[in-house]
Interface confidence: low
């Protein structure tokens, strides 16, 4: 049975050119997190961090997104592109999937400085 | 264009050991993961395991792990695959696959490598 | 692990049959699923991934659709050309599975 929850950063917005956390967590339960899956709206992956191989980002993102913290991923120098729903999803032993959802915002920098309160700490 | 080139067919006894290349061209060859993939005669396809060309970490399939070693060689842009204590059942045509750029999918082949096993 | 399954085994269509393959994983794979398309003597070539999206370069008569565990390919003209064995392949994490093929044969 699935006892465990996904807590998320929810909605975020961030600087065009700037960098911005997703952040993940995974609680209530003490299922083994084998892997974690980043994927972007239109489901291609950005990276995977695998408990025993470690991260892995692949190739049409390496020069923009940064591993971590934790099992999180650091996207950088953001573009009007980048905007939309971002997924974590951890594969757990025994429990099996739990799916996360972030919703990304990128705005001009004008825009930007008034929504500081939606950038992670 | 990218380009994956291995080598020529070989044929070996039961107990010995193959070491298959594959060259790799028109790309940066440390970017991305080098798989192989091996498809016995009349059958589908079986992943064996992966390198990453720019840390040389390796990930194997369980059911060759104790028999597979991959390596690189970044000069020459090469990837290796050497199957050890070979039976008849290792018969088969090796690939090298390039991975995809949002997953590990193969969008790129090698040409395949026959190895026979054979007394 | 996760295993693929394919659907029929083998078909026998005519030129200009539409032409449905189907791929049943073991458990939830969300979209994480890639088709190939591979002819006697030559490598697999890469039709789809990410479960819908067209490689570079693959007609437009091709198309995958579905998620989770049930997914489909389907050619909507089938063309001498598309003869061949098809397989499909779960792409996130390890191992990476292939199912058994679907062998496409002239009826």
């Known amino acids: 049975m699935m006892t465990g929850t996904i807590e998320t950063t929810g909605n975020i917005s961030a600087k065009k050119g700037g960098s911005v956390i997703l952040q993940c967590h995974l609680s209530s339960t003490m299922a083994q997190v084998t892997q974690v899956n980043w994927e972007q709206h239109d489901h291609s992956l950005l990276a995977i961090r695998n408990a025993e191989l470690g991260w892995h980002i692949y190739p049409a993102f390496k020069d923009r997104v940064a591993p971590g913290p934790g099992l999180g991923l650091t996207l950088q120098s953001l573009t009007m592109n980048d905007t939309g729903e971002y997924f974590c999803t951890y594969h757990t032993y025994p429990d099996g999937t739990y799916r996360g959802r972030i919703f990304l915002e990128v705005l001009e920098s004008s825009v930007a400085e008034h929504s500081a309160r939606f950038q992670i700490p | 264009e990218v380009q994956l080139v291995q080598s020529g067919a070989e044929v070996k006894k039961p107990g010995a050991s193959v070491k298959v290349s594959c060259k790799a061209s028109?790309?940066?060859?440390?970017?991305?993961?080098m798989h192989w993939v091996r498809q016995a005669p009349g059958q589908g396809l079986e992943w064996m395991g992966r390198i990453d060309p720019d840390s040389t970490g390796s990930k194997y399939n369980e059911k060759f792990k104790t028999r597979v070693t991959m390596t690189r060689d970044t000069s020459t842009s090469t990837v290796y695959m050497e199957l050890s204590s070979l039976r008849s059942e290792d018969t088969a045509v090796y690939y090298c696959?390039?991975?995809?750029?949002?997953?590990?999918?193969?969008?790129?082949w090698g040409q395949g490598t026959l190895v026979t096993v054979s007394s | 692990d996760i295993q693929m399954t394919q659907s029929p085994s083998s078909l026998s269509a005519s030129v200009g049959d539409r032409v449905t393959i189907t791929c049943r994983a073991s458990e939830n794979i969300y979209s994480y699923l890639a088709w190939y398309q591979q002819k006697p003597g030559k490598s697999p070539k890469l039709l789809i991934y990410n479960a819908r999206t067209l490689a570079e370069g693959v007609p437009s008569r091709f198309s995958g659709s579905g998620s989770g565990t049930d997914f489909t390919l389907t050619i909507s003209s089938l063309q001498p050309e598309d003869f061949a064995t098809y397989y499909c392949?779960?792409?996130?994490?390890?191992?990476?599975?292939f199912g058994g093929g679907t062998k496409v044969e002239i009826k």
């Open positions: 696959a390039r991975e995809g750029a949002y997953g590990y999918y193969f969008d790129y």
């Open positions: 028109g790309y940066t060859f440390t970017n991305y993961w």
């Open positions: 392949q779960y792409h996130s994490g390890s191992p990476l599975p």
